[in-house]
């Protein structure tokens, strides 16, 4: 099996304020085992947007059923977008570890820009 790649096919996505934004991400392999997380920004100050394993993310829904066997699609939809949501979003694969999961590979990022609500 080829080594896993994290594919974010869109470099940028533009959404009108108030709408939902779909951020696409998929894996080329099911291995290694471990959760997916979405972050806004990179580095130490990045903001967690979604954690497949745990947590409550009321504005975020997954596009596919993540529990489905052989699922490779980890795209998310963020509802009620505001200008504060603008930024670059990264889909990150973690490898299952003990006691903590270890970051394995990140997607290239998708820049979300927010347009003014059409009048």
């Amino acid at each position: 099996e080829d080594e896993l790649q994290v594919i974010q096919p869109e470099k940028s996505v533009s959404v009108a304020a108030g709408e939902s934004a779909t951020l696409r991400c998929a894996m080329t392999s099911l291995i290694p085992v471990g959760p997916i997380m979405w972050f806004r920004g990179a580095g130490a100050g990045r903001e967690l947007i979604y954690n497949q394993k745990e947590g409550h993310f009321p504005r975020v829904t997954t596009v596919s059923e993540l529990t489905k066997r052989n699922n490779l699609d980890f795209s998310i939809s963020i509802s009620n977008i505001t200008p504060a949501d603008a930024g670059t979003y990264y889909c990150v694969k973690f490898r299952k570890g003990s006691p903590d999961d270890v970051e394995f590979k990140s997607g290239a990022g998708t820049e979300l820009s927010v347009r003014a609500k059409p009048s």
């Epitope: 099996e1 080829d2 790649q5 594919i7 096919p9 779909t22 696409r24 998929a26 894996m27 080329t28 596009v63 596919s64 059923e65 490779l72 699609d73 795209s75």
Partner: antibody, heavy 122, light 108 residues
């Protein structure tokens, strides 16, 4: 530019065999899943077969399972479809098509060849 | 096996009009795996929409896709002369990667 060129079509008798080829250029062939799709005269599109980028997994429509074999040679940037036990209902234009992303079968097929015609007739 | 059903079979419209094409899956599917293609006579298909709602590169914004679950729609807001063609939806992700039967958009 990104291009797919099919060849190998022709007229064959029922029960006969043909091997189609698809030569790829302009992209990293070894990174993408590939597909064969056919279209019978005056009919719609029918997905036939797909293969992962590494060639490690293959997928077939029920209508061709056991008769057709998809394969690829990444060193030659070429996709193949070996067609055996051909039937009249296999008569169609055969297109090869590239997966849109490196993830097999995700989002769609973004590059298509112009097709090669296979006619099965006695 | 999931069946993709397109309707109507033929849509007769004039340039400038709005076209609404439907694609229905026999069971719920992820929108990530729904694509739309355009095919003109004698030509190969062209990817229009992927992930149910995202336009492929170079596709004009008069084309839009929507839907989720079992019901998906391709809308052409104002038909241009070059838009008269056959349109197919396709379910990806699983095998077989089923196409719908197509909708022909013809000039009225």
């Amino acid at each position: 530019q990104v291009q797919l060129v099919e060849s190998g079509g022709g007229v064959v008798q029922p029960g006969g065999s043909l091997r189609l080829s698809c030569a790829a250029s302009g992209f990293t062939f070894s990174a993408y899943g590939m597909n064969w799709v056919r279209q019978a005269p005056g009919k719609g599109l029918e997905w036939v077969s797909a293969i992962r980028a590494s060639g490690g997994a293959t997928y077939y429509a029920d209508s061709v399972k056991g008769r057709f074999t998809i394969s690829r040679d990444n060193s030659k940037n070429t996709l193949y479809l070996q067609m055996n036990s051909l039937r009249a209902e296999d008569t169609a234009v055969y297109y090869c098509a590239k997966d849109f992303t490196e993830v097999v079968g995700w989002l769609g097929m973004d590059v298509w060849g112009q097709g090669t015609t296979v006619t099965v007739s006695s | 096996e999931i069946v993709m059903t397109q309707s109507p079979g033929t849509l007769s419209l004039s340039p400038g009009e709005r076209a609404t094409l439907s694609c229905r899956a026999s069971q719920s599917v992820s929108s990530s795996y729904l694509a739309w293609y355009q095919q003109k006579p004698g030509q190969a298909p062209r990817l229009l929409i992927y992930g149910a709602s995202s336009r492929a590169t170079g596709i004009p914004d008069r084309f839009s896709g929507s839907g989720s679950g079992t019901d998906f729609t391709l809308t052409i807001s104002r038909l241009e002369p070059e838009d008269f063609a056959v349109y197919y939806c396709q379910l990806l992700g699983s095998s077989p990667r089923t196409f719908g039967g197509g909708t022909k958009v013809e000039i009225k």
